[in-house]
């Protein structure tokens, strides 16, 4: 408060939050994601709000399509600037299928290991971004349960672009991506009309992620 007892700047911006979180972003890079620039713009806007460092927030990125790739580990970069540069360089790897359960499971089993930089006692957060129903849905229930068992908080984002472009029903897709999100679903699930609209959820997503350590 000010000397005149006025409330001044009472809400700190997200980027000033020097909280400790291990965040792994699980990106769908299958062929139907278009344009990829929208995904990297979303990453840029989200990451620049974070205070990244070995004693602050750490970020790793996993990309999946028909298989899975670790783009970079949690402990690879020690500043927001370095992560931003690396994230801009991520190329879309494509894929004939959308293996969402595989992407999530690989993040859980591999990306969140100490060998890749995960820290003991630090909250684990996963952000899953996808534009289509998984081809490995038959594995999804178990994969989500495994994440629950390891206390991994999950935010899921459904990009409806390919469905809208093809005039397809989004109902089953939205249902599936909601099932990935942690409870309460309304605070952990987002959907956007297309890839370009990803940037519109960044502020709210960022706030909800960092509210986990409030």
């Amino acid at each position: 408060v000010s000397p005149t007892f006025q409330v001044v700047n009472s809400i700190a911006p997200v980027q000033e939050c020097s909280t400790q979180l291990d965040i792994v972003i699980v990106l769908d890079g299958s062929n139907s994601i278009y344009p990829w620039d929208s995904v990297t713009a979303f990453l840029n806007d989200l990451l620049e709000r974070m205070d990244i460092g070995p004693k602050q927030t750490q970020v790793g990125i996993v990309q999946y399509g028909e298989n899975v790739t670790h783009e970079f580990n949690l402990n690879k970069y020690s500043s927001t600037e370095e992560v931003l540069v690396a994230a801009k360089k991520i190329v879309q790897r494509g894929g004939r299928q959308t293996m969402t359960a595989l992407g999530i499971d690989t993040a859980r089993k591999e990306a969140f290991t100490e060998a890749r930089g995960a820290r003991r006692g630090v909250k684990k957060v996963m952000v899953i971004v996808t534009d289509g129903e998984s081809h490995d849905n038959h594995r999804l229930k178990q994969v989500i349960q495994d994440c629950e068992d390891e206390n991994i908080q999950r935010f899921s984002i459904a990009i409806l672009g390919s469905y809208n472009r093809g005039n397809l029903s989004t109902e089953k897709f939205v249902e599936e991506i909601k099932s990935i999100a942690s409870e309460p679903t309304e605070k952990h699930f987002f959907n956007v009309s297309d890839e370009l609209a990803l940037v519109t959820i960044v502020k709210t997503l960022g706030e909800r992620i960092f509210a986990l350590e409030a």
């Epitope: 299928q97 093809g166 089953k172």
Partner: antibody, heavy 120, light 107 residues
Framework: EVQLVESGGGLVKPGGSLRLSCAAS????????MSWVRQAPGKGLEWVGR??????????DYAAPVKGRFTISRDDSRNTLYLQMNSLKTEDTAVYYC???????????WGQGTTVTVSS | DIQMTQSPSSLSASVGDRVTITCRAS??????LNWYQQKPGKAPKLLIY???SLESGVPSRFSGSGSGTDFTLTISSLQPEDFATYYC?????????FGQGTKVEIK
């Protein structure tokens, strides 16, 4: 529990027809690519064909020995996969399995199989 | 079509033995190679996917290795329940193709 249950096998004469069914449960069937695989008595495994999901065009692919005679279809509202077999030959005698198919895992879920015998 | 060649076609071994089965693809399939176990009268069961990943619930004595064209399935210490037929399969391209199988019998 993820489960596939085949039915419809039986004895049929050469030149005859048969339709096999595969009932799926425990997962969102409409998401999956499905395959049929067969195994002749005392022989190895042979892929028969595959159907993609509706959002991928529901396209089908077949092994050379069955192309033009066998047709794979699906009814997502009934969670059921079908194999329509026409112009059957004695060499089509086999146990027929339905499977979920992905490039990464291959065929990670199988039904128990249904036996087709083609004999005069 | 990609041809898959397994060797040996059969082998005799004792409980506790280390068993190795090889599979060769006629062209590179990266790591899109799966191994299945089949017992008489039963459906095949996935053991190893993506050349080296152990399927959930499969004992750790089973392991897979290789990339490109040459692959190996190893059973580190053969158990009585491991006597079965083993198949490799490529899922890199359509049609997916199987090896001819390796029957593991009791010595």
């Amino acid at each position: 529990e993820v489960q596939l249950v085949e039915s419809g096998g039986g004895l049929v004469k050469p030149g005859g027809s048969l339709r096999l069914s595969c009932a799926a449960s425990g997962f969102t069937f409409s998401n999956a690519w499905m395959s049929w695989v067969r195994q002749a008595p005392g022989k190895g495994l042979e892929w028969v064909g595959r159907i993609k999901r509706k959002t991928d065009g529901e396209t089908t692919d077949y092994a050379a020995p069955v192309k033009g005679r066998f047709t794979i279809s699906r009814d997502d509202s009934r969670n059921t996969l079908y194999l329509q077999m026409n112009s059957l030959k004695t060499e089509d005698t086999a146990v027929y399995y339905c499977t979920i198919y992905t490039y990464y895992y291959g065929m990670d879920v199988w039904g128990q199989g249904t036996t087709v015998t083609v004999s005069s | 079509d990609i041809q898959m060649t397994q060797s040996p076609s059969s082998l005799s071994a004792s409980v506790g033995d280390r068993v190795t089965i090889t599979c060769r693809a006629s062209q590179s399939i990266n790591n899109y190679l799966n191994w299945y176990q089949q017992k008489p009268g039963k459906a095949p069961k996935l053991l190893i996917y993506a050349a080296s990943s152990l399927e959930s619930g499969v004992p750790s004595r089973f392991s897979g290795s290789g990339s490109g064209t040459d692959f190996t399935l190893t059973i580190s210490s053969l158990q009585p329940e491991d006597f079965a037929t083993y198949y490799c399969q490529q899922s890199y391209s359509t049609p997916p193709t199987f090896g001819q199988g390796t029957k593991v019998e009791i010595k």
